[in-house]
């Protein structure tokens, strides 16, 4: 077979498997007279041989671990032993089987990881080595994790990275790891070889011993701090420290207060730095966060709660300038003639707020001083000594003092006498009759007048009379006003009227005085009218249960998902449709029976969120008619949007020759939603081969600088590519381009010869 | 297993400057921060500073934050440092080296093998 | 800065001797509130980079040798190896990991008689 096993000498590759034991030749070289014999040198370790006629072949199996390549020379020689053609170079490749197992690099490993640590986060790596070539699956590794023990609730608390052999913390082992619980844990970790593919493959084990530290990172017990102090400030209040020193420490105020009086220092002691004012803000909320020293953080926030606690520092005040009150010519002793309501910014239910009453003086004190008492802590005003006559005195003034456990305030009190509330209200009309209302008659329609008359003393609670409906109106669908000067009665719809529910209804109303009648007077029939109401059907549109229907979910959600739901119901019982109304995105679509929402199309939070539609449900039957609620949908960020630049950057340029190197600032965006901290993108350049004329590096999260290295550059275009990426979950890299053009420049301008006009640079750096 | 690669010996002039590379393997490269140390006869180790590449953050010795630059290429999990304004003092041996776990006070578990910078005219 | 000092500079011992050395801290490397040392020791043999023997003052990296023991709190730390074999022939550093900018002592050297 000439070619394949035999031919002339020349450079030649073969491969060979290790480990297999010689079956053949490896090649036969043809010999050009005056050549008449072969040499062979090299890498031959006493393994390769060419008879004196040409025939390469190896006389026992080889090992790859021990040589890959075995690098020949083949010579040609004539009769006299010199070498007339050659030496030329035989390459022998060694393939690579399997005849090697993974073995760790040790039998035992240590570590410890710390409660609540980040999942995912390596704590801690196992080795395993293979002598087979790593390029091919001999050589590839696969840790697995064989058990945990202990072994929780059939929980992994741990992970590997199958590849790399990174053990870190599950979801689960971040939330639930107690060192209090269980201090230690031992993980079996296998090797396989052969990617662990294959049932051939080789493996090893070792044994990992993780101990479990205690996350000090915890919020503190709530913190009370007196209002007003005159302490000097700051006050330390509490503490927060991270489980290692060197945390940046800082303060997150959620609230946005106008003034936030609290503050961190670099030890994680947080202090007060002002008076506090419980009656200006009675508690706070606001969170610690720990740093890394690159300014990121390093575990949740802390949430910090701080109880301002009272002190008296409010005095009583009065409900008004004057308090008036009324009261009865022959009103009986002990009867109440009103309440004084004085009230006290301090806390609720304290000595601070507990107020006591005392009537400090009486004018005129006629026909004696002492005719009224005050009930001490309820501030209610009794008549003390004996009943008053209006033509005597028509009016009393009382100075009260009101007073907490330290201040003291006057209120005045105004006790008008008035005539004995001897005389009943009586109603001009016992029936008003029958009264016929369609069921869509408006909230707020006046609907009946009504009137009756008092011959107590006009203008006083005796004869001012009260209208109550006693009867018939449990839903509390009707209302009564009083005009005052008149007594007149105004029958007003205060809800809607409903043929559904309440058809007819028999009202009956009371008419009474706010003053106590006198003894052995009680109100009668004459205090007392009817009517009945009579309410009409009305074919009323479905009733959404609520004016606008939210629901919240991810932007990414598959398509045909559930995204929320909408219910109405008909008053007259009929079934409903539903639709939707304004889906200008063509996002929804809705069951028409059920009212449930899907989402047919997928959903983009930058496009706008919320997405308003209206829902529609109308009547199956009957007069269709229909009513329409909102849908709100609220779409929650996820990371979908790669970075880009924040504006058009055309038009940098750099006068040519660069005297010194130079640099620009750019702006990245993405269109995701940025809580808390703003973007974080980091910068680099796009490829390699930029290292040597650029350097890209960042100011902060959204602003990066773009240098020249060198002024070698020469006079034109360049198209500089720059990698963004922004840090999100999953990470997304947006990679733009600057055009960048060196130009000779004529007064700090790019200079550019007429009839050359396509974009000409305008920024000068 | 993890391995810092560092970039070969620098012979340079006076006022030049040099970027020394290392390149990092057996790990995820954000998840952990890379620092570097520069060690003299005279002055024994010196922390020079370190580079976040997960956030581009960077953290420095005052005494050399105008001499180096500490920058990395994610996509090559290659930790660079650039030295600037170069003179006799700043002959040494740098080393990069990495935590041996994420934390704020790690000491420096695995470090790459050194790279010799001369500074002579 | 916090200042670290090293001593002795050298020291020369026969195998098989216990040998200790000294690392003082100009403040206290102790964080109160984990009762751990923020101080490290490496070892750098000729020719090499260093290498992690003791983190937290008295806690051993994996596979370094039980013979290498460290102690001490505060500001005074002491590493002790306790029956030295050849291959220990090194200088060894002490580090603080308390705050930046790191520092390191200056070395002590140890030699085989």
């Known amino acids: 077979q000439e070619g394949k096993f035999s031919g002339p000498l020349k450079p030649m590759t073969f491969s060979i498997y290790e480990g297999q034991e010689p079956s053949q030749i490896i090649f036969q070289f043809k010999a050009n007279p005056p050549a008449v014999t072969f040499e062979l040198t090299g890498e031959t370790d006493n393994i390769f041989v060419i008879e004196r006629e040409g025939l390469l072949y190896y006389n026992r199996a080889l090992d790859r671990e021990t040589r890959s390549t075995h690098n020949l020379q083949v010579a040609a020689l004539d009769a006299n032993g010199i070498i007339v053609e050659g030496p030329v170079p035989i390459t022998i490749k060694v393939k690579d089987i399997n005849d090697n197992r993974p073995t760790f690099l040790q039998s035992k490993y240590e570590g410890s990881v710390r409660q609540n640590s980040r999942p995912g986060k390596p704590f801690l790596y196992v080795n395993a080595t293979d002598l087979d070539d790593p390029a091919t699956p001999n050589g590839q590794l696969y840790y697995q994790i064989v058990i945990q023990l202990p072994m929780i609730n059939n929980v992994m608390y741990f992970q590997i990275n199958n590849k790399t052999g990174a053990i870190s913390l599950t979801r689960e082992g971040s939330q639930e790891l107690n060192p209090a619980k269980n201090p230690s844990y031992n993980l079996v970790i296998s090797v396989k070889d052969m990617g662990g593919q294959s049932e051939n493959s080789f493996s090893d084990t070792t044994s990992v011993d993780i101990i479990v530290t205690e996350n000090i990172w915890k919020a503190p017990k709530p913190v009370e701090m007196v209002e007003n102090s005159t302490d000097p400030h700051p006050i330390k209040i509490t503490q927060v420290r991270w489980n290692d020193p060197g945390a940046q420490y800082s303060l997150v105020d959620k609230e946005k207060l106008p003034r936030f009086p609290f503050s961190i220092d670099q030890e994680g002691d947080i202090y007060v730095t002002q008076p506090l004012d419980r009656e200006e803000k009675d508690a706070y909320v606001f969170y610690a966060v720990a740093k890394d020293e690159y300014g990121k953080p390093l575990s949740y926030p802390l949430e910090i709660h701080v109880k301002v606690k009272d002190i008296n520092d409010n005095p009583p005040t009065c409900p008004s300038p004057v308090t008036v009150f009324e009261v009865q010519e022959n009103e009986r002793l002990g009867n109440s003639i009103g309440t004084l309501t004085a009230h006290d910014r301090d806390e609720e239910n304290t000595a601070n707020s507990f107020l006591n009453y005392r009537i400090v003086e009486q004018t005129p004190k006629l026909p004696m001083d002492g005719l009224f008492l005050i009930q001490t802590y309820a501030g209610m005003l009794q008549l003390a000594k004996q009943s008053l006559k209006k033509q005597d005195t028509p009016q009393y003034n009382l100075t009260i003092e009101v007073s907490d456990k330290d201040f003291k305030t006057l209120c005045f009190v105004q006790i008008n006498v008035i005539d004995i509330n001897d005389q009943i209200p009586i109603f001009e009309k016992s029936d008003y009759g029958n009264l016929t209302l369609a069921e869509d008659t408006n909230i707020g329609s006046t609907i009946l007048t009504i009137q009756a008359t008092d011959a107590d003393e006009p203008f006083t609670g005796s004869s001012k009379i009260l209208y109550h409906i006693i009867k018939g109106d449990s839903e509390g669908r009707l209302g009564v006003d009083t005009d005052p000067h008149t007594n007149t009665g105004y029958v007003i719809i205060k809800k809607p009227l409903d043929f559904e529910t309440a058809a007819v209804s028999n009202i009956v109303f009371k008419a009474e005085n706010p003053e106590p009648l006198v003894f052995g007077v009680k109100y009668n029939a004459s205090s007392f009218a009817k009517f009945t109401l009579i309410v009409t059907d009305v074919n009323e549109a479905p009733q959404f249960s609520q004016h606008v229907f939210q629901a919240k979910v991810s932007e990414d959600v598959a398509i045909g998902t559930k995204v929320g739901n909408v219910t109405a119901k008909d008053p007259e019982g009929l079934d409903i449709s539903y639709s939707l109304r304004g889906d200008t995105r063509g996002w929804l679509k809705i069951d028409h029976v059920t009212g449930e929402i899907f989402s047919v199309a997928p959903l983009d939070r930058e496009a706008g969120s919320p997405y308003r539609v209206q829902v529609v449900a109308t009547e199956v039957g009957g007069s269709s008619l229909s009513s329409v609620s909102e849908f709100h949908l609220i779409l929650m960020d996820v990371n979908d949007n790669p970075p880009r630049l924040a504006k058009d950057y055309t038009g940098l340029f750099f006068c040519h020759p660069l005297s010194a190197p130079g640099s620009l600032i750019f702006e990245a965006t993405d269109d995701d939603q940025h809580l808390f901290r703003g973007p974080h993108f980091t910068f680099s350049l796009g490829s390699g081969s930029l290292q040597n004329d650029w350097e890209v590096s960042k100011i902060n999260g959204t602003h990066a600088r773009l240098s020249t290295r060198h002024t070698e550059f020469e006079e034109r275009e360049y198209v500089v590519l720059i990698r963004i990426n922004d840090g999100g979950r999953p990470p997304l890299e947006g990679i733009v381009s600057l055009p960048v053009t060196f130009c000779s420049c004529v007064e700090g301008s790019c200079f550019r010869p007429a009839g050359h006009q396509t974009g000409i640079p305008t920024v000068g750096m | 297993q993890v391995q810092l690669q560092q970039s070969g010996a620098e012979l340079v002039r006076p006022g030049a400057s040099v970027t020394l590379s290392c390149k990092a393997s057996g790990y995820t490269f954000t998840d952990y921060d890379m620092h570097w140390v520069k060690q003299t006869p005279v002055h024994g180790l010196e922390w020079i500073g370190g580079?976040?590449?997960?956030?581009?953050?960077?953290v420095y010795n005052l005494r050399f934050k105008d001499k180096a630059i500490l920058t990395a290429d994610k996509s090559s999990s290659t930790a660079y440092m650039e030295l600037r304004s170069l003179t006799s003092e700043d002959s040494a041996v740098y080393y990069c080296?990495?935590?041996?776990?994420?934390?704020?006070?790690?000491?420096?578990?695995?470090w790459g093998q050194g790279t010799l910078v001369s500074v002579s005219a | 800065d916090i200042g670290m000092s090293q001593s002795p500079s050298s020291l020369a011992v026969s195998v098989g001797e216990k040998v200790t050395m000294s690392c003082k801290s100009s403040?206290?490397?102790?964080?109160?509130?984990?009762?751990?040392?923020?101080l490290a020791w490496y070892q750098q043999k000729p020719g090499q980079s260093p290498k992690l023997l003791i983190y937290w003052a008295s806690t051993r990296e994996s596979g370094v040798p039980d013979r290498f023991t460290g102690s001490g709190s505060g500001t005074d730390f002491t590493l002790t190896i306790n029956s030295v074999k050849a291959e220990d022939l090194a200088v060894y550093y002490c580090?603080?990991?308390?705050?930046?900018?790191?520092?390191f002592g200056g070395g002590t050297k140890l030699e085989i008689k």
């Open positions: 580090q603080q990991c308390y705050s930046y900018p790191r520092t």
């Open positions: 403040q206290s490397l102790l964080y109160s509130s984990n009762q751990k040392n923020y």
């Open positions: 580079f976040d590449p997960e956030s581009a953050g960077t």
């Open positions: 080296a990495r935590k041996g776990y994420y934390s704020v006070s790690s000491p420096f578990t695995y």
